[in-house]
């Protein structure tokens, strides 16, 4: 048993301490609070990456991460961590956060593809909504594009795709 779980008597043998933990860390603490984008699996007695369970109807606690992950898979949408909602970039182009830059800039270059409300907005027919623009200020700093946390590992998007494909 690795140090991430609790042994029956609370102490750990030399073997316990030397066993490699499931996260690839060597640790001697009973860890019940996990890094972001991981959850504590009480049966496994360790932190687990949420990414592996997003396809499950799990009772465990990865709902927010999985919503975010699924949202990022949809083109033209991004996950707003403050609102805890999947936002359509088309609805906020013109006052959009960094996550929508690619979508909105491409759409604005090609007005034929824009929905009517955005064509009007581009022509100045719709005035800015300060609530919206305020809401998204600084949202690019929320790390909604971060990779799933694997403690002790820094993986690129390509590497993560390999790990979880």
């Amino acid at each position: 048993m690795s140090g991430l779980g609790r042994s029956r008597r609370g102490g750990r043998s030399r073997v316990d301490q030397e066993e490699r933990s499931p996260q690839g860390l060597w640790t001697g603490v009973a860890m019940r609070s996990c890094p972001e984008e991981q959850y504590w699996d009480p049966l496994l007695g360790t932190c687990m990456s949420c990414k592996a369970i997003c396809n499950h109807q799990s009772q465990r606690t990865c709902a927010t991460f999985c919503r975010s992950l699924n949202c990022r898979k949809e083109q033209g949408r991004f996950y707003d961590h403050l609102l805890r909602d999947c936002i359509s970039c088309a609805s906020i182009c013109g006052q959009h956060p960094k996550q929508c830059a690619y979508f909105c800039e491409n759409k604005l270059r090609s007005p034929v593809n824009l929905p009517p409300e955005l064509r009007r907005q581009r022509s100045g027919e719709v005035e800015n909504n300060s609530d919206n623009s305020g809401r998204y200020q600084g949202s690019e700093h929320r790390g909604s594009e971060a990779s799933p946390a694997l403690p002790g590992l820094k993986l690129s998007a390509d590497q993560l795709a390999l790990v979880y494909s």
Epitope: P22, L44, A52, Q59, V163, S165
Partner: antibody, heavy 118, light 107 residues
Framework: QVQLVQSGAEVKKPGASVKVSCKAS????????MHWVKQKPGQGLEWMGY????????KYAQKFQGKVTMTSDKSTSTVYMELSSLTSEDTAVYYC???????????WGQGTLVTVSS | DIQMTQSPSSLSASVGDRVTITCRAS??????LNWYQQKPGKAPKLLMC???RLHSGVPSRFSGSGSGTDFTLTISSLEQEDFATYYC?????????FGGGTKVEIK
């Protein structure tokens, strides 16, 4: 469909080692934790430990520390469970079982009988 | 470790009977209680997870109930293929632990 196919029965001498394999198919191998469960003849089920194939992290039941080693081979989607210093107490059927992330084991291998006899 | 106690250890019943097996945990396991069916010479099969959620392909005559420490598996009308040994398992706390099993035999 999900399938876990284990290696065949083994007969070993006391003091020897044995390595049992469990080949997974029908799902993404690295996304699931694999557990091993022991069942002595005519007895109940006993959890031994698990391995996370994506990084070969392991966790073993206290009773099996020093007795069992679990490894995996991502290229063949196979997990292995090795028992060392065999005694008659190790005579049992060993099962691999996939963890479903909700506290249960949703698919099981067919079992491998290991007999330790002089 | 959490101890799981099943009762009875064996029972005799006839086809068509209603059968109830109980499982008690030594401490609260919420609803993380699973049931498995095992036939002689075969691997266990998951019947039910999270107390009452049937695994795919499991007939609706099987049902589960309980919460905390006391749980029940019920077979509403026993069929020939249901004669087997049933195990409960807690999935709430490391390490996972199994009950001792209940053998359902033909009367």
């Amino acid at each position: 469909q999900v399938q876990l196919v284990q290696s065949g029965a083994e007969v070993k001498k006391p003091g020897a080692s044995v390595k049992v394999s469990c080949k997974a198919s029908g799902y993404t191998f690295t996304n699931y934790v694999m557990h091993w469960v022991k069942q002595k003849p005519g007895q109940g089920l006993e959890w031994m430990g698990y391995i996370l194939p994506y990084n070969d992290g392991t966790k073993y039941a206290q009773k099996f520390q020093g007795k069992v080693t679990m490894t995996s081979d991502k290229s063949t989607s196979t997990v292995y469970m090795e028992l060392s210093s065999l005694t008659s107490e190790d005579t049992a059927v060993y099962y691999c079982a996939r963890y479903d992330y909700e506290g249960s084991f949703d698919y099981w291998g067919q079992g491998t009988l290991v007999t330790v006899s002089s | 470790d959490i101890q799981m106690t099943q009762s009875p250890s064996s029972l005799s019943a006839s086809v068509g009977d209603r059968v109830t097996i109980t499982c008690r945990a030594s401490q609260d396991i919420s609803n993380y209680l699973n049931w498995y069916q095992q036939k002689p010479g075969k691997a266990p099969k998951l019947l039910m997870c999270y107390t009452s959620r049937l695994h795919s392909g499991v007939p609706s005559r099987f049902s589960g109930s309980g919460s905390g420490t006391d749980f029940t598996l019920t077979i509403s009308s026993l069929e020939q293929e249901d004669f087997a040994t049933y195990y409960c398992q807690q999935g709430n706390t490391f390490p996972p632990t199994f009950g001792g099993g209940t053998k359902v035999e033909i009367k």
